[in-house]
Structure formats: C-alpha cells, structure tokens
C-alpha cells in the first residue's frame, strides 16, 4: 500500500515538473511572440513610414486617379478656405467631370455625412459668369444650382450630391486638392 | 478694377533660373492671397504655388526646392522665383488673386522656355 502511494506521488511529481516544464515553455514561447510582435511592429512602422515618404498623397488626404483631396476639419469663409489650400501647395477643390464629383460626395458621405463644403468656384461679379479658381468656366452639367439670393459675392459649396451657391462670407468646411505625385519608378 | 500683370519670363537653358514679377493694381494687395499658375500647350492650367495674406507659402510637388514665392505689400508685387529650371517647366505663368468677397483675378501670363 506504503508502495503505492509512493508511486503515484511520484508520478504526480513528475507531472508537476512537466506542467512547470510547459509552463516555462508557453512563458518563454510568449516572451519570443512579445519580441517578434515587436520587431514586426517596428517593420511594419519602418515600411510605412518609408512608403509615406513615396506615397502619392500626403497623410489625411485622400487619393482618387491623380489627384489629392484633404477635407477640412474646420470651417472658414471661402477666402480663407482658399488661402489654407494655397498653404498646402493645392487649390479649392476644382471639379472636372461627374465621375470625380460623385467620388466626392461619396467620400464625403463616408467621412462626415451631409454638411457644406467650399469649393473652388466663385461668381465674376461684373459678367455672372462662373469661374474655377485656375480661371476656367465650369463644364455645362456642373453649374451650381441656383440657391443665393444675396446681392452679395457668391461662390460654390458642394453639399450630398448637389452643387450649390451660397455667400462667399459664410462659414463652412471645404476641400483642396492638388495632384498626386507621380511614382518615379 | 482689379488688374494684374506678369513679367520676366524669357528663354532660358536647363539648370538656370528665372524671377517673375506680378503687379497689382486697384486692390488692396496686402489682404488677398496670390497665386502662380502655369500652362504648358494641350495642358490644364496647374498651380505652381502661392502666398497668404499672412505670408505663408505652398508649393506644388513638381516644383518643391526650387521655386520660390515672395511678396512686397509695399510695391503691390507677388514674385516667383525659378532656379534650377527644366525643360517640363515650359510654360505661360499666370497669377491669380481672389479678393475677401469671392472676386477672382487674372494676369494675361508671361511665356516661360527652357531649352535643353
């Protein structure tokens, strides 16, 4: 009996040394995980702040075919909205084609939902004819809707899925663009 | 009436450089932002970079390091100045303004030619 008590706590024992044999395996195996965690932490970090110096658009700003588009955080009259742009080496954002202006208030939907953003069109105050900030009139299908009654200046916002007018004094957020840079490979 | 005027533009090899000058007149230059533009043929009219009323600088990536803008508030003059000027920096360069209240402005643009 004496004998076989004996037996089992050895073997018992034994299973506690190879629990704690497990153990110290599992903590070493995590520590070696913690490390490699870390070291591909500090690649991936590595990669992508050597991918940022080459990336075709500066951080917070998004890309669509060649060009850059940031969205503001803040909002300003349309003066200012241009001068922030001019800041950043861009313009007010200028709208080419429908295809880009649906890739706006797609992106726009996507990121802050339905609010007014300047864009880079403004009303000739002697003529009445619209102008892009490069001086170009606009395409015949991306003429703001008629919504300012005010007799003062008025530039183009851009607001879901229409393009409208509104007092170039009035505050609201608004979009640059720029082109993306050209991958020198 | 807002007027602007460009001058300095030239023939110039690569490599060399180049000032711009734009004159305005009828605004009250100190508060309006400028802005340099260029044209190449067949091309869209492209910002090359600009000045705040507080003047804060931008620049396109193409011309980053060796395009510089200034201003002289007192002389109602906006510069661009071009060094190290290459072959695809061939172009009209315009200057634009827009005032406070929304009015843009455009110079009639001076021809930039750099040859190789």
């Known amino acids: 009996k004496l004998l076989q008590v004996s037996t089992i706590a050895m073997q018992q024992q034994e299973k506690l040394i190879q629990q704690e044999r497990a153990l110290l395996n599992f903590t070493e195996w995590k520590r070696s995980c913690a490390l490699q965690m870390k070291y591909c932490q500090a690649f991936m970090q590595n990669s992508l702040s050597s991918a940022h110096n080459s990336s075709p658009c500066p951080n917070n700003w998004i890309q669509n075919r060649e060009s850059c588009y940031y969205v503001s955080e803040i909002w300003s009259i349309w003066h200012t909205s241009q001068e922030n742009c001019l800041k950043e080496g861009s313009t007010l954002l200028q709208i080419e084609s429908k295809e880009e202006m649906d890739f706006i208030t797609g992106s726009l939907r996507k990121i802050k939902g339905s609010y007014d953003y300047w864009v880079g069109l403004s009303q000739d105050g002697h003529s009445g004819r619209w102008l892009w900030q490069d001086g170009s009139s606009p395409s015949p299908g991306l003429l703001p809707a008629e919504r300012s009654q005010s007799a003062n200046q008025v530039c183009g916002y851009v607001k879901s899925n229409s393009l409208l007018s509104s007092n170039c004094s009035t505050w609201k957020y608004f979009i640059c663009e720029k082109y993306a840079l050209r991958s020198s490979v | 009436q807002v007027q602007l005027q460009e001058s300095g533009g030239g023939l110039v090899q690569a490599g060399g450089s180049l000032r711009l000058s734009c004159a305005a007149s009828?605004?009250?230059?100190?508060?309006?932002?400028m802005a340099w533009y260029r044209q190449a043929p067949g091309k869209r009219r492209e910002l090359v970079g600009g000045?705040?009323?507080?003047?804060?600088?931008g620049y396109a990536d193409s011309v980053k390091g060796r395009f510089t803008i200034s201003r002289d508030n007192a002389k109602n003059t906006a510069y661009l100045q071009m060094n190290s000027l290459k072959p695809e920096d061939t172009a009209v360069y315009y200057c634009?303004?827009?005032?406070?209240?929304?009015?843009?402005?455009w110079g009639q643009g001076t021809q930039v030619t750099v040859s190789s």
């Open positions: 009828g605004t009250l230059f100190s508060i309006n932002g």
């Open positions: 634009g303004t827009s005032t406070p209240r929304g009015d843009s402005y």
């Open positions: 000045i705040t009323s507080d003047g804060s600088t």
